[in-house]
């Protein structure tokens, strides 16, 4: 029988091994959300194993949504070009590996895994089912592959080869940034505050990435996005440390850990508070 029969119409054995995703959200179906905007975005298609375009409605949806094709590829694909033979270079972990365990505000009781920066190991925790942060993995293996160091202090992917040129920040690359700042935190810290669709008036905090501060807003009780924190401290912990202030064209104010050479830019014009 032909190999096409074995793999249906998706991909053949000779082309690629079965997909090993860098992030579980790459397996989500593209979700345009309930709103009616027409925004060109990209998602990773697990069947074609490629990043593809879709139209996003502007609210809700899921994390398999990227502003650019490049960002999608960096988050969800492992090209051969991104694999190199092990060298003495230490690869840096994605920023979200350093976020604290966050069960979120919902009341599910779901086993997930997070990277504990104190123990330098991936550990089990109970996730509530919504919000939280991206230091949250469906499987122990996925957490280890992304956040733990390999046996020689390397970060390794599923194939045992060192990840190279993976963009460790989660922010859009296609947009403009104030020259004084660089952002390296979770992508949802750049999203506008979103009240959601219900009728409650709960006190919450969102990260305003224009001014680099956490600000209060009224949450409706459902929907919205992940830039939504129950306390100012939680908001600052998740988002504030993503900003690094520049002191000159090439230099950075000293921080706890090295940053990628790749610079990430934030949208100045797209930041606003929705439904306020």
């Amino acid at each position: 029988d032909s190999e096409e029969d074995e793999e249906h119409t998706i991909i053949t054995d000779t082309e690629l091994p079965p997909l090993k995703l860098m992030h579980s959200f790459c397996a989500f179906k593209a979700d345009d959300g309930p709103c009616k905007a027409i925004m060109k975005r990209f998602f990773f298609n697990i069947f074609t194993r490629q990043c593809e375009e879709f139209i996003y409605g502007g609210c809700e949806g899921n994390q398999n949504r990227f502003e650019s094709l490049e960002e999608c590829k960096k988050m969800c694909t492992r090209d051969n070009a991104n694999r190199i033979i092990k060298t003495t270079l230490q690869q840096e972990k994605p920023d979200f590996c350093f976020l604290e365990e966050d069960p979120g505000i919902c009341r599910g009781y779901i086993t997930r895994y997070f990277y504990n920066n104190q123990t330098k190991q991936c550990e089990r925790f109970k996730y509530g089912g919504c919000l939280g942060n991206m230091n949250n993995f469906e499987t122990l293996e996925e957490c280890k592959n992304i956040c733990e160091d390999g046996p020689n202090g390397f970060q390794v992917d599923n194939y045992g080869t060192q990840l190279n040129a993976v963009n460790n920040s989660l922010t859009p690359q296609s947009t403009k940034v104030p020259s004084l700042f660089e952002f390296h935190g979770p992508s949802w810290c750049l999203t506008p505050a979103d009240r959601g669709l219900c009728r409650a008036n709960e006190n919450r905090f969102y990260y305003n990435s224009v001014i680099g501060k956490c600000r209060p807003f009224k949450y409706s009780g459902c929907g919205g996005n992940e830039n939504n924190f129950t306390s100012k401290q939680e908001c600052l912990r998740a988002c504030k440390k993503g900003f690094i202030q520049r002191i000159s064209k090439g230099g950075l104010i000293k921080t706890k850990r090295k940053r990628k050479k790749q610079r990430v830019k934030i949208a100045y014009e797209e930041i606003f508070v929705k439904n306020m």
């Epitope: 091994p17 997909l19 979700d31 949806g61 899921n62 499987t139 122990l140 293996e141």
Partner: antibody
Framework: QVQLVESGGGLVQPGGSLRLSCAAS????????MSWVRQAPGKGLEWVSS????????YYADSVKGRFTISRDNSKNTLYLQMNSLRAEDTAVYYC??????????????WGQGTLVTVSS | DIELTQPPSVSVAPGQTARISCSGD??????VYWYQQKPGQAPVLVIY??NRPSGIPERFSGSNSGNTATLTISGTQAEDEADYYC???????????FGGGTKLTVL
């Protein structure tokens, strides 16, 4: 040609144990997630358990958690389901199914013909 | 938790279009898969999302939006008589869910 052949089914008393096996051929077994899905007589399909290609992660339906254990031996191209503390409601045809890729979020694209497990005193 | 609800039975005349629904909360935001099972046989994947595996006739198609996914069989033939199951993966709880199944009768 992809082939999945289940074995190990049979009659067992409540509280007893059985070990099901699934011999795989016609594809690179070590590169695919695998699952067990069951079907009680005259009823619908129910997912039981999945295991990713490297064996490092396993997933179970609530109805079998703590009683069933899925495992695989990639060197033997074989998938297993160890069933302990069996109950009458575990009576079903048990299907071995290959998932379309490495992860347990892929759909089941090939199925075996099933093996019948009957739990009765 | 996802719950998928299917009608227990659907009848269609030969050559007509059969539509089998699968409803669940916001199911349109998830991948849905359809399996055909004939008596005494193992299930066969006939639709993944809105795609058809090779070897599945063109008369089978799938759509999914809002709270309902639909399997459509255009120009239904006698050989299409079978049980049909929808399925989806719950990425929050990491488990698979099947609908209760629909018996398609070709009159």
């Amino acid at each position: 040609q992809v082939q999945l052949v289940e074995s190990g089914g049979g009659l067992v008393q409540p509280g007893g144990s059985l070990r099901l096996s699934c011999a795989a051929s016609g594809f690179t077994f070590s590169r695919y997630a695998m699952s067990w899905v069951r079907q009680a007589p005259g009823k619908g399909l129910e997912w039981v358990s999945s295991i990713i290609s490297s064996s490092s992660e396993t997933y179970y339906a609530d109805s079998v958690k703590g009683r069933f254990t899925i495992s695989r031996d990639n060197s033997k191209n074989t998938l297993y389901l160890q069933m302990n503390s069996l109950r009458a409601e575990d009576t079903a045809v048990y299907y071995c199914a290959r998932l379309m890729g490495y992860g347990h979020y892929y759909p089941f694209d090939y199925w075996g013909q099933g093996t019948l497990v009957t739990v009765s005193s | 938790d996802i719950e998928l609800t299917q009608p227990p039975s659907v009848s269609v005349a030969p050559g007509q279009t059969a539509r089998i629904s699968c409803s669940g909360d916001k199911i349109g935001s998830k991948y849905v898969y359809w399996y055909q099972q004939k008596p005494g046989q193992a299930p066969v994947l006939v639709i993944y999302d809105s795609n058809r595996p090779s070897g599945i006739p063109e008369r089978f198609s799938g759509s999914n939006s809002g709270n309902t996914a639909t399997l459509t069989i255009s120009g239904t033939q006698a050989e299409d008589e079978a049980d049909y199951y929808c399925a989806s993966y719950d990425s929050i709880y990491s488990y698979w869910v099947f609908g209760g199944g629909t018996k398609l009768t070709v009159l």
